[in-house]
């Protein structure tokens, strides 16, 4: 034996079946009988590796029997029909359901035929990414945080950044038994140049059709970085009024601008208007150093600019005009 035929009967099933935690899944299993071959199936059996006994049996006279009747069901097998489809549905998947299962057909005259199927129990993680707001620490600190919650198996997190830095990834048990929460931090030395720039967290998991990309806009708090613009070294007497601008970059935004000179308060020809300083026309040469002091929640910083108003050739009357 086996008796002659065109080919042996074959049990067809996928080597691996994925299912989601809490959901139902079908373990497909079919008996393929080549054209000239004859077979009679009297029993279908499902058992799990490492466990004694069978978990589901369909017998041609007794019908179905299950180790856990509320969780198992033969999808297609019915009394009085040819038993060629042993597919089994499992409800309410649990982590402990993951493992190797054997689907077995008891046939005549060939004997039993079986196949093994690996059931993978997956849990689709929820992903979030958030900024970690930092100040200028001078040392590496986390500036962004990416969390993949409740994945099975654990999600894989990578970062994409043009700013330099390095990841720090850790795992912890998820809320549901057997799941994993993955936390990844993007670490770099904060600088004002980093503020407002973005990094991308990429989360990969076999339950996703494609990786999930989460973009984080970074926040670095820093005191004002101040410079004064508007002076081109070519200011002359009897020209139009001119303007100096106090350029400040800071996070949070500046709360105040204060103009002064190295000699003390502003001279009469200089009028402060917030971030701008209006220089009215003067009738005699000056050489004054202006100071712009900018304040935000983290402190105050200042910039200085020395302005000279010179006697100029009459052919260039408009040298001071900058507006």
């Amino acid at each position: 034996w086996p008796p002659p035929g065109t080919g042996d009967i074959i049990v067809q099933a996928p080597t691996q079946v994925p299912g989601f935690l809490g959901d139902s899944v079908t373990l497909p299993c079919y008996l393929q009988v080549p054209g000239m071959e004859e077979t009679h199936v009297s029993q279908l059996t499902w058992s799990r590796h490492g466990e004694s006994g069978s978990m589901a049996v369909f017998h041609q006279t007794q019908g179905p029997n299950y180790s856990e009747p509320k969780r198992l069901e033969f999808v297609a097998a019915r009394l009085g029909t040819e038993l060629r489809d042993a597919s089994l549905r499992m409800f309410g998947l649990r982590v402990e359901d993951e493992g190797n299962y054997t689907c077995l057909f008891v046939t005549f005259p060939q004997g039993s035929r079986s196949v093994d199927i690996w059931l993978r129990v997956l849990a689709k993680p929820q992903n979030t990414a958030e900024v970690q707001k930092v100040q200028l620490t001078g040392k590496p600190v986390p500036v962004a945080r990416c969390v993949s919650t409740g994945g099975r198996p654990p999600a894989h997190i990578t970062w994409h950044s043009d700013l330099g830095g390095m990841p720090n990834t850790s795992q912890a048990p998820g809320f549901l038994s057997g799941t994993v929460t993955v936390t990844s931090l993007w670490i770099l030395v904060p600088s004002s140049q980093v503020d407002g720039k973005s990094v991308t967290c990429k989360v990969e998991h076999e339950s996703f059709e494609k990786p999930q990309l989460l973009t984080v806009n970074l926040t670095v708090y820093y005191p004002p970085e101040v410079s004064i613009s508007g002076y081109d070294n070519n200011w002359y007497l009897s020209q139009n009024e001119a303007t100096l601008t106090c350029d400040a970059r800071s996070n949070p935004e500046p709360t105040g601008y204060n103009w002064s000179t190295t000699m003390g308060p502003l001279p009469p020809f200089a009028v402060a208007q917030g971030a701008q300083l209006l220089i009215r026309p003067v009738d005699k040469p000056i050489n004054t150093t202006f100071i712009c002091n900018v304040t935000n929640a983290l402190g105050a910083r200042q910039a200085e600019l020395t302005v000279q108003v010179k006697e100029g050739p009459p052919s260039e009357p408009s040298g001071m005009s900058s507006n």
Partner: antibody, heavy 115, light 107 residues
Framework: EVQLQQSGPELVKPGASVKISCKTS????????MHWVKQSHGESLEWIGG????????NYNQNFKGKATLTVDKSSSTAYMELRSLTSEDSAVYYC????????WGQGTSVTVSS | DIVMTQSQKFMSTSVGDRVSVTCKAS??????VAWYQQKPGQSPKALIY???YRYRGVPDRFTGSGSGTDFTLTISNVQSEDLADYFC?????????FGSGTKLEIK
Amino acid sequence: EVQLQQSGPELVKPGASVKISCKTSGYTFTEYTMHWVKQSHGESLEWIGGIDPNNGGTNYNQNFKGKATLTVDKSSSTAYMELRSLTSEDSAVYYCAGVIPLEYWGQGTSVTVSS
Amino acid sequence: DIVMTQSQKFMSTSVGDRVSVTCKASQNVYTNVAWYQQKPGQSPKALIYSASYRYRGVPDRFTGSGSGTDFTLTISNVQSEDLADYFCQQYNSYPLAFGSGTKLEIK
């Protein structure tokens, strides 16, 4: 109710042949495979072979190849086993039994081989 | 061929007791094992299929267990009508094979 009714006891001479019948009722004959089992006096059970009434396909225990021949008559829902070249070793009770595993059993047919 | 070994030829028990009949297969037969009861002068009767499932109408004091190569038929609360021979049988592959039987005697 499924019933398997076997033919009566047989007393046969060595070298002869005998054909035992097993008439079934209470189910569709072609639905279950039919098997034959030998039980020598006070001994265990020995599977002789089986037949699928649907297509006549058979499977024999090597120990009984050439000794037993299994056939069916679908029109009368009856299975047959012929035993040939009988010796005293063949004296036993023979059962027909339907389905795998053997769920439905006939009452047995006693075969005595004696000169 | 697979050999089914029932090492206990006889077992003696009392009414109300619990008794276990064991059977060992010479190779893995999964759960494809049946148990039969044969009372004196009668045909065998199927008790258990697929190692642990009772046929309809079989009292629940008969329990089967095991898989692979080691199998057990347990009779709890033994009754006098349980006096019989008990045979295991593998139906995983051909030839089908029976154990040599265990005779249960009631004290």
